[in-house]
Interface confidence: low
């Protein structure tokens, strides 16, 4: 016997209180697949999050981060503070890269300069906090 709920399309839910009639998802909720018995609450992009895509009856809202922050985690579950090039984010905020390390992005951590001598090369251009060394012949 076919489950009557399987006929309910995305954007609706199978309402047990109304003889398993397919009812539209209430405001601020959605169902992205058919045959669902409940609609999921829409994600709200608050605070440091901003709305990239509004919630519809068939798809959840999508968030990104306000300027000065970048997304972290699946589906932008967190916003992480941007730092300047030449810095890394620590639990005390942005800190300059230590000597011998660099970061050429606004996110991520400082990485050691390339050791040119490992490849039998010499340093052509010295490294900075923002840039790796350039190795030469």
């Amino acid at each position: 016997l076919q489950d009557p709920c399987s006929n309910c399309p995305a954007g609706t839910f199978c309402d047990n209180n109304r003889n398993q009639i397919c009812s539209p998802c209430p405001p601020n909720s959605f169902s992205s697949a058919g045959g669902q018995r409940t609609c999921d609450i829409c994600r709200q992009c608050k605070g440091v999050f901003r709305t990239r895509k509004e919630c519809s009856s068939t798809s959840n809202a999508e968030c990104d981060c306000t300027p000065g922050f970048h997304c972290l985690g699946a589906g932008c579950s967190m916003c992480e503070q941007d730092c300047k090039q030449g810095q890394e984010l620590t639990k005390k905020g942005c800190k300059d890269c230590c000597f011998g390390t660099f970061n050429d992005q606004k996110r991520g951590i400082c990485r050691p300069w390339t050791n040119c001598s490992l490849d039998g090369k010499s340093v052509l251009v010295n490294g900075t906090k923002e840039r790796d060394v350039v190795c030469g012949p």
């Epitope: 985690g73 967190m78 984010l89 620590t90 639990k91 005390k92 951590i109």
Partner: antibody
Framework: EVQLLESGGGLVQPGGSLRLSCAAS????????MSWVRQAPGKGLEWVSD????????DYADSVKGRFTISRDNSKNTLYLQMNSLRAEDTAVYYC???????????WGQGTLVTVSS | EIVLTQSPGTLSLSPGERATLSCRAS???????LAWYQQKPGQAPRLLIY???SRATGIPDRFSGSGSGTDFTLTISRLEPEDFAVYYC?????????FGQGTKVEIK
């Protein structure tokens, strides 16, 4: 060789005070953040407080905020933890650790035991 | 506060076996900020892994770390007698700094 040596622990009554010290050697003390981490008998590790290289920025766990004060004297290569209004739940081994911020705590002292009991 | 939950609480294994320890965060943590420590009775903790997967100085290559987001793993490929200890994960992504409750690796 990096060494951290804590001292100042002991038995103190509830409501009392104690000042822990951590003498550092083998590295440029004034260049590093430092932290205190404690461990109650038979329990896990709990971060207590940290301080930046200049001593201007400090942070505390909620459980000790307003009662404990972290400080440092870079001329003496020494880290301190002033503990006031001590409670039974502050009983623990207190470790000082060099704090690499993003990269965790790479060197630890041997710990000093603080017992708060009447 | 980011809560780190370690599992299992105790792992009973024999020398030579593989140990897999889990650390789950209550919210996403950049892998750069996740560390693992080993602690033996009466001793201070020792840093094993930082940045979720980088071995600290002097740590043998049988120790490896992996993971991202909310799920992190410490693997000991072949347990040596000196590896039986308690292991803690720790995050320094945001205040307060937090540790997991620990996993004890004991001899079976």
């Amino acid at each position: 060789e990096v060494q951290l040596l804590e001292s100042g622990g002991g038995l103190v009554q509830p409501g009392g005070s104690l000042r822990l010290s951590c003498a550092a050697s083998g590295f440029t003390f004034s260049s590093y953040d430092m932290s205190w981490v404690r461990q109650a008998p038979g329990k896990g590790l709990e971060w207590v407080s940290d301080i930046d290289p200049t001593g201007s920025k400090t942070d505390y766990a909620d459980s000790v905020k307003g009662r404990f004060t972290i400080s440092r004297d870079n001329s003496k290569n020494t880290l301190y933890l002033q503990m006031n209004s001590l409670r039974a739940e502050d009983t623990a081994v207190y470790y000082c650790a060099r704090d690499l911020m993003v990269y965790g705590f790479d060197y630890w002292g041997q710990g000093t035991l603080v017992t708060v009991s009447s | 506060e980011i809560v780190l939950t370690q599992s299992p609480g105790t792992l009973s294994l024999s020398p030579g076996e593989r140990a897999t320890l889990s650390c789950r965060a209550s919210q996403s943590v950049s892998s750069s900020y996740l560390a693992w420590y080993q602690q033996k009775p009466g001793q201070a903790p020792r840093l094993l892994i930082y940045g979720a997967s980088s071995r600290a100085t002097g740590i043998p290559d049988r120790f490896s770390g992996s993971g991202s987001g909310t799920d992190f793993t410490l693997t000991i490929s072949r347990l040596e007698p000196e590896d039986f200890a308690v292991y803690y994960c720790q995050q320094s992504y945001s205040y307060p700094v937090t540790f997991g409750q620990g996993t004890k690796v004991e001899i079976k």
